[in-house]
Interface confidence: medium
Amino acid sequence: RTVPPMVNVTCSEVSEGNITVTCRASSFYPRNITLTWRQDGVSLSHNTQQWGDVLPDGNGTYQTWVATRIRQGEEQRFTCYMEHSGNHGTHPVPSGKVLVLQSQR
């Protein structure tokens, strides 16, 4: 079976002018997934991202996250790239509100 992830992108201010953007993937199966931040359409290097473990979420599916720190005002340059079981998608940083996107099967 394949269950596509729900992808959710959120922002939180960490200091003046700087924000942490977090991309969460949840409720997916199987557990293999690629989740990475892109800037200007290119994957960020590993040393500028933090990843969470891929963990079971209690429903027979999995969840994980990736975060990076960016400067306020450059949100439009960043997208979260997800690849899972042959499906892939890009998810922008929301402007002012949380964005929840269901990947297509």
Epitope: V14, D40, G41, V42, L44, S45, T68, R69
Partner: antibody, heavy 121, light 112 residues
């Protein structure tokens, strides 16, 4: 080894058009962003345009915005710069460069030999 | 746009002696990811530019270790510990933090 070969330069009248090409080899072209940089005769370097690996992110210098169009054909390992409404101040050697700054690497680590564009009546 | 300045614009050096080039930016190039997006290039006579230093202080592949880069958010220095004849050319700093990317005017290093 990595090779970038520009072509398409030449003499053109003000208001005319040219299309520059950059043929890439020796690396997986579709994985990398690319940029065009130019250098007027006897002058310094000026960044012109950027395109992401998939062509979904494109940026231009203000001096060429609305006149120049960057594009790529990943199947042909080629980068292009369509230049319209050319002006005398566009006269320069145009270089194509790789842009690998997000791969734990760095930007502009490979440059072509350049192609000269001369805009004159 | 971020404005880049360099000094000196001309630098005559005796082979074997050290050399230092200064670069300044009108805005801090320190990103919140702690990388500083300042690059150094050398353009030898009749050649395309080549990268020397990336992200302020990292030596690019194949570049001799007599070159080094340092600095803070807005003030940067390229040092050559012992200049050799092959080091002649024009040295450019460039900010790669935000669009449009901008270069300094260049510093011409020549052998005395």
């Amino acid at each position: 080894q990595v090779q970038l070969v520009e072509s398409g330069g030449g003499l053109v009248k003000p208001g005319g058009s040219l299309r520059l090409s950059c043929a890439a080899s020796g690396f997986t072209f579709s994985n990398y962003a690319m940029s065009w940089i130019r250098q007027a005769p006897g002058k310094g370097l000026e960044w012109v345009s950027y395109i992401s690996p998939g062509g979904d992110y494109i940026y231009y210098a203000d001096s060429v915005k609305g006149r120049f169009t960057i594009s790529r054909d990943n199947a042909k390992n080629s980068l292009y710069l369509q230049m319209n409404s050319l002006r005398a101040e566009d006269t320069a050697v145009y270089y194509c460069t790789t842009d690998r700054r997000h791969y734990g690497s760095y930007a502009m680590d490979y440059w072509g030999q350049g192609t000269l564009v001369t805009v004159s009546s | 746009d971020i404005v880049m300045t360099q000094s000196p614009l001309s630098l005559p050096v005796t082979p074997g002696e050290p050399a230092s080039i200064s670069c300044r930016s009108s805005k801090s190039l320190l990103h919140s990811n702690l990388n500083t997006y300042l690059y150094w290039f050398l353009q030898k006579p009749g050649q395309s530019p080549q990268i020397l230093i990336y992200r302020m202080s990292n030596l690019a592949s194949g570049v001799p270790d007599r070159f080094s880069g340092s600095g803070s958010g807005t003030a940067f220095t390229l040092k050559i510990s012992r200049v050799e004849a092959e080091d002649v050319g024009v040295y450019y700093c460039m900010q790669h933090l935000e669009y449009p990317f901008t270069f300094g005017p260049g510093t011409k290093l020549e052998i005395k």
